[in-house]
């Protein structure tokens, strides 16, 4: 999916109002220095591409993020403010239901969410630069 035509201001507002709080809640008990940020992004569409990948694509050591509240809100935000995004999710949603896994917060998942926080912050910064 090409995130170029998204309403970035609306996405930023949703992130600051609610998604960020859920990400921070998920990370509670860990320090920001616990993990190194290894994933970066260069512009707003690229940031959203990386955010989508890290939030919804299961990895061998962290398969459960898509069911988290911040992930559900991220999906809702992208479906609302990115033209045509929702239709790309119809088959993906059905596949995810079949893949349902036990919810476990592993250290690897905490590291992934730490990366997500970094990507979202980068997204906000690239937005501020453009204004």
């Amino acid at each position: 999916y090409d995130f170029t035509n998204c309403d970035f201001q609306k996405i930023e507002a949703d992130y600051l109002r609610t998604i960020s709080k859920d990400l921070i809640t998920y990370m509670s008990g860990t320090k920001s220095t616990d993990f190194n940020n290894t994933v970066s992004c260069s512009n707003r569409p690229h940031c959203l591409t990386e955010i989508q990948s890290l939030t919804f694509n299961p990895t061998p050591r962290c398969a459960s993020l898509a069911k988290e509240m911040f992930a559900r809100k991220t999906k809702a935000t992208l479906a609302l403010w990115c033209p045509g995004y929702s239709e790309t999710q119809i088959n993906a949603t059905q596949a995810m239901k079949k893949r349902r896994k036990r919810k476990v917060t592993t250290n690897k998942c905490l590291e992934q969410v730490s990366q997500l926080l970094g990507l979202w912050r980068r997204f906000i910064r690239t937005l501020l630069k453009k204004q």
Partner: antibody, heavy 120, light 107 residues
Framework: QVQLVQSGPEVKKPGSSVKVSCKAS????????MHWVRQRPGQGLEWMGT????????DYNQNFKGRATITADKSTSTAYMELSSLRSEDTAVYYC?????????????WGQGTLVTVSS | EIVLTQSPGTLSLSPGERATLSCRAS??????VHWYQQKPGEAPRLLIY???QSISGIPDRFSGSGSGTDFTLTISRLESEDFAVYYC?????????FGTGTKVEIK
Amino acid sequence: QVQLVQSGPEVKKPGSSVKVSCKASGYIFTDYAMHWVRQRPGQGLEWMGTFIPLLDTSDYNQNFKGRATITADKSTSTAYMELSSLRSEDTAVYYCARMGVTHSYVMDAWGQGTLVTVSS
Amino acid sequence: EIVLTQSPGTLSLSPGERATLSCRASQPISISVHWYQQKPGEAPRLLIYFASQSISGIPDRFSGSGSGTDFTLTISRLESEDFAVYYCQQTFSLPYTFGTGTKVEIK
């Protein structure tokens, strides 16, 4: 089963406001946005706006911006649509309709409609 | 704002005939089109979503096709209960919009 039950018909004077409610049951309220659509007598469907409980945000059709306010009470699974500065052209049936925000993404259930008559 | 134009405005057919309804978008919207049926005094009812996806409980005589700017709703053999107004709707981008409607009436 999924049900959206709207408040009863209203007769209003020009310049006044009306608040229509839509009580949802049979599903998880926060998994769906609530949209409002109106239909003037003998006319087509017109999207007014939406409230997304999951994100606590709303969006409006520019034609209604400033006059329409869409809210929701998550504790009672009830959505509201308030329209102010009413004029005769606002005489219409107002529908609420749910739409999935993390799946389905389509208005798959509708309220029965609320007739609002604006007359002096 | 994406404008949806439906044609024809009215379709006069007999029971058993095939109905073909058209919906044209003012810009490409991939497959983000849904079809609704509305009978007098009733709320709209979803028939087809995302251009061609069928809904459980909807008779299989209803089918949808198309992508980009041109979409079609087909009713293979009209039954008496199918005479109604049909609307297409786009959810490609906000504000969501509806088509002008096609009335299918008995000839």
